[in-house]
């Protein structure tokens, strides 16, 4: 990000780890939905977790806002909340379901599963 | 979002506000920007905030892999973080700045103003 | 190479309730879809519902309010239950295997050899 | 549910000669969603063909199948005395799954 450069390097002081990938296992089951899913019945979606603290790291991909949030928040936590780790990147995953007319449907759903991390 | 019309209608107890856009003023001399920004010296960012409940209303335009997460976070927070606030749709601004080699430059910056907000 | 052995009483009285097992062997049962099928003597094939190894089910509708399909992965078995049976649910009861990827699905391979079970008082 | 109907319900033929079994649907099956397979006095059934032209594994080329929607097609190119059997269809494009009524190929 263009402003990215401007942000300083004042280091952090919270060793809870920064934004980046975790798993998450999805059970279809357990979220009820197989009664209309086939396959798969489970799969690894991952989810973003962490601090984004400043300054913002160039592989997190802030945005221009996000430099400027992350700045603030820096210089005034309380006036200014932080920015937040999210998928910046998602990949799809076909699924075979059975449809509302009971017909089995194999179909690509978009953003199911998080392929990398950012502050935003 | 496909995956949206098959969260349920568990109504929220959170009396929090929900994901909505709120005000962040931007003061480039308060972050000592000053000495390279000529103009705007200041402006309205916005920015994010608020809870990300199950269920995601559409107007929050949940990815799927965030439906998923979501529910998923509302029948065990504990093992699965709630999805985030975080903006959706973003403007540029122009702005006229001094570069290296003291020239004054007209440049439009991206990604600077909040439109949006959802959960993520 | 998988194989599959159906096992339960050759006989129960109408009104009862059929219950069958089927071992699954050289194979984990998880990751596939386990299916029950009968077929009465003489007649065709009737699907009557499967199981996935995390307890997902689905059955045939007019069978569904009698019927229960369950599964123990710790003894790689899976099991039916036909409640309230009558002559008519006389059959040759048989266990098979569907692959549950999206790219192979909604076929049985292999098939148990069947079972005979007679409903008779 | 989709219902299959096969004909002839019974085929009379020699060894050598080539068998054509039809099975019809009462809709249309999604992706060409069928199996067939055979069966012999006293066994179970055995999967010849899925996805309405794929062999399964270990069959012999000289079955084949055909077809789409709601037509399909199982030929048998030059009869074996072991291919004579009951030969069932069965879609997996709508649930519930359904099992043709059968076609009987029998030694003319």
């Known amino acids: 990000a263009p402003l990215a450069t401007r942000q300083g390097k004042r280091p952090s002081k919270n060793l809870k780890a920064r934004c980046s990938r975790k798993a998450l296992h999805v059970n279809f089951k357990d979220m009820g939905w197989d009664d209309w899913i086939i396959a798969p019945l489970e799969y690894e979606a991952f989810h973003c977790e962490g601090l984004c603290e400043f300054p913002l790291r160039s592989h997190l991909e802030p945005t221009n806002h996000a430099v400027i949030q992350t700045l603030m928040n820096s210089m005034d936590p309380e006036s200014t909340p932080p920015t937040c780790c999210v998928p910046t990147r998602l990949s799809p995953i076909s699924i075979l379901f059975i449809d509302s007319a009971n017909n089995v449907v194999y179909k690509q759903y978009e953003d199911m599963v998080v392929e990398s991390c950012g502050c935003r | 979002a496909p995956l949206a019309t098959r969260q349920g209608k568990r109504p929220s107890k959170n009396l929090k506000a929900r994901c909505s856009r709120k005000a962040l003023h931007v003061n480039f001399k308060d972050m000592g920007w000053d000495d390279w920004i000529i103009a705007p010296l200041e402006y309205e960012a916005f920015h994010c905030e608020g809870l990300c409940e199950f269920p995601l209303r559409s107007h929050l335009e949940p990815t799927n892999h965030a439906v998923i997460q979501t529910l998923m976070n509302s029948m065990d927070p504990e093992s699965t973080p709630p999805t985030c606030c975080v903006p959706t749709r973003l403007s540029p601004i122009s702005i006229l700045f001094i570069d290296s080699a003291n020239n004054v430059v007209y440049k439009q910056y991206e990604d600077m103003v909040v439109e949006s907000c959802g959960c993520r | 190479q998988v194989q599959l052995q159906e096992s339960g009483p050759g006989l129960v009285k109408p009104s009862e309730t059929l219950s069958l097992t089927c071992t699954v062997s050289?194979?984990?049962?998880?990751?596939?879809?386990w299916s029950w099928i009968r077929q009465p003597p003489g007649k065709g094939l009737e699907w009557i519902g499967y199981i996935y190894y995390s307890g997902s089910t689905r059955y045939n509708p007019p069978l569904k309010s009698r019927v229960t399909i369950s599964v123990d992965t710790s003894k790689n078995q899976f099991s039916l239950k036909l409640s309230s049976v009558t002559a008519a649910d006389t059959a040759v009861y048989y266990c098979?295997?569907?692959?549950?990827?999206?790219?192979?699905?909604?076929?049985?391979?292999?098939w148990g050899q069947g079972t005979l079970v007679t409903v008779s008082s | 549910e989709i219902v299959l109907t096969q004909s002839p319900g019974t085929l009379s033929l020699s060894p050598g000669e080539r068998a054509t079994l039809s099975c019809r649907a009462s809709q249309s099956v999604s992706s060409s969603y069928l199996a067939w397979y055979q069966q012999k006095p006293g066994q179970a059934p055995r999967l010849l063909i899925y996805g309405a032209s794929s062999r399964a594994t270990g069959i012999p080329d000289r079955f084949s199948g055909s077809g789409s929607g709601t037509d399909f097609t199982l030929t048998i190119s030059r009869l074996e005395p072991e291919d004579f059997a009951v030969y069932y269809c069965q879609q997996y494009g709508s649930s519930p799954l359904t099992f043709g009524g059968g076609t009987k190929v029998e030694i003319k």
């Open positions: 050289g194979d984990s049962i998880s990751s596939y879809y």
């Open positions: 098979a295997r569907i692959c549950s990827s999206t790219s192979c699905w909604g076929w049985f391979d292999p």
